[in-house]
């Protein structure tokens, strides 16, 4: 009956952690004697190829300084405890502690048997490092040039993490990779770039980080912050301002970042009706007269700049009763 070595084609271990490289001789055959078990690294330099051996009488040996005896152990293999007990070598699973990047590579588990001869199996050990992720908005001021408005950083991953963005905005990503402080790891930085305008302020975009150490992608929401001058509009005019009307109000509606620091009401004609009283963002009209046949201007200031809006007012002689709505304001 033929025997075979059962190994995993690939084993993944966490950088700094412990990994087991399973190796079993199957099936159990009466009279099949395992005289030696060895683990080798065929791709390593000659003086580092022999990693571990298990001799039925002498037990385990770990000759190579890399990984070295302090980081290696046989999980189940047992040497003969006396002259009358057999060694148990069918399970040659090797544990590797304190994984380093240099541990990555091919490992050959070999059973020297009698009478079947030598049989072996090979495992590829991959050393991975789970990255630490963070994302943050960059405080930017509106401009005509593409600017980084958010950063997503995946620190010290192995292999490098894959970063993408989820957003309905018109954007592009710029990625950089640098070596992590832990040898063999990579820090990936993705810059979410767009032409910063008020439309982007307060919008939430999502950084998506994918890595084989994650069960599912990491999704990190980021709320953008764009400083921009006030964007102004005027509401409250209902096309039914008539002489003597007393309940009219204009509101200066503003989107801005940061908050407005001042409101200024004026007219294009240069004359300002005395019955119109500015109260911050509102213009309260006590009584509409003919001077209201003008264009009102609301100018709003913030730390970035200023914005303005105009509203043309047409004063009627009498109320418009044909479907006119309630008064604005």
């Amino acid at each position: 009956q033929d025997v075979r070595v059962q190994v995993l084609p690939e084993v993944r271990g966490q950088l700094g952690g412990t990994v087991e490289l399973p190796c079993h001789l199957l099936p159990p055959v009466p009279g099949l004697y395992i005289s030696l078990v060895t683990w080798q690294r065929p791709d390593a330099p000659a003086n580092h190829q022999n990693v571990a051996a298990f001799h039925p009488k002498m037990g385990p040996s770990f000759p190579s300084p890399k990984p070295g005896s302090e980081r290696l152990s046989f999980v189940s293999a047992k040497q003969s405890t006396g002259q009358d007990t057999e060694a148990e070598l069918q399970d040659a699973t090797l544990a590797l502690h304190g994984l380093t990047v240099e541990d990555e590579g091919n490992y050959t588990c070999e059973f020297a048997t009698f009478p079947k001869g030598s049989v072996r199996g090979m495992t590829w050990l991959r050393v991975i490092a789970k990255p630490k992720n963070q994302a943050e908005a960059q405080k930017v001021t509106f401009s005509q040039d593409p600017t980084t408005v958010a950063l997503c950083i995946s620190k010290e991953g192995r292999p490098p993490a894959r970063i993408s963005w989820l957003s309905s905005l018109d954007w592009e990503a710029k990625e950089t990779q640098v070596s992590g402080t832990l040898a063999g790891t990579v820090t990936v930085t993705s810059r979410f770039t767009l032409v910063p305008s008020g439309r982007a302020d307060g919008v939430t975009v999502t950084c998506k980080v994918e890595h084989e150490s994650f069960e599912e992608p990491a999704l990190i929401p980021v709320t953008l912050s764009v400083r921009y001058p006030p964007e102004v509009s005027i509401s409250g005019y209902d096309d039914n301002w008539y002489l003597g009307r007393t309940d009219a109000t204009l509101s200066c509606d503003v989107r801005s970042n940061p908050e407005p620091t001042g409101y200024d009401w004026s007219t294009t004609s240069g004359t300002f009706p005395t019955s119109a009283v500015a109260q911050g963002s509102q213009l309260v009209i006590h009584a509409v007269d003919s001077l209201f046949n003008t264009t009102f201007v609301c100018t709003v200031t913030n730390a970035v700049g200023m914005g303005r809006a105009e509203q043309v007012i047409f004063v009627r002689e009498t109320p418009n009763t044909a479907g006119a709505g309630a008064t604005g304001g």
């Epitope: 009279g31 005289s35 030696l36 060895t38 022999n50 003969s80 007990t85 030598s118």
Partner: antibody, heavy 116, light 107 residues
Amino acid sequence: EVQLVQSGAEVKKPGSSVKVSCKASGYIFTSYWIHWVRQPPGKGLEWIGAVYPGNSDSNYNQKFKARATITAVTSTSTAYMELSSLRSEDTAVYYCTKLVGTFDYWGQGTTVTVSS
Amino acid sequence: DIVMTQSPSTLSASVGDRVSVTCKASQNVGINVVWYQQKPGQPPKTLIYSASYRYSGVPDRFTGSGSGTDFTLTISSLQAEDLAEYFCQQYNTNPFTFGQGTKLEIK
């Protein structure tokens, strides 16, 4: 302590047979193969074959398969190697040996001289 | 069968010398090679197993190296008690085969 004690020296005529014994002690006899290796005077070592006392399975070097018979008697913990049709080039020291990783335990050797 | 060709057949050296014995396999045997030392009138004793692993109690002046088809036993500083014959043996494939031996003489 593991011990392998072999039978005494033999002088044989060409064409005859010789049977060498190897009495084992100090371990479970049925759990380990007993191998036979020979060494002609001033020459190297040559593996003849082995027996597994647990099920009497045997395994031979093809060179000796037609002439060698290796057996084991569990009741006495003794292994035997019989070589037939002896010729002068079979003159050698014959060792029984126990494989524990390597050939770790050896009998003291039995000198077989084939001479007319 | 795998042929193990050992050289030299005789080696004469002085105490303190560094000496090497080589063994060439006729086909790849991995690291499945043992080195034995045999003193006159005694059975062989294991020095090195799996090509480079020193057996228990063997002085560290004995080292083994090699893999595949080429193997070397080195004695870093020859001692008088090293007067013996040395054999390599492959256990990769049945039947086990031995080198023809290297007789080490002390000058």
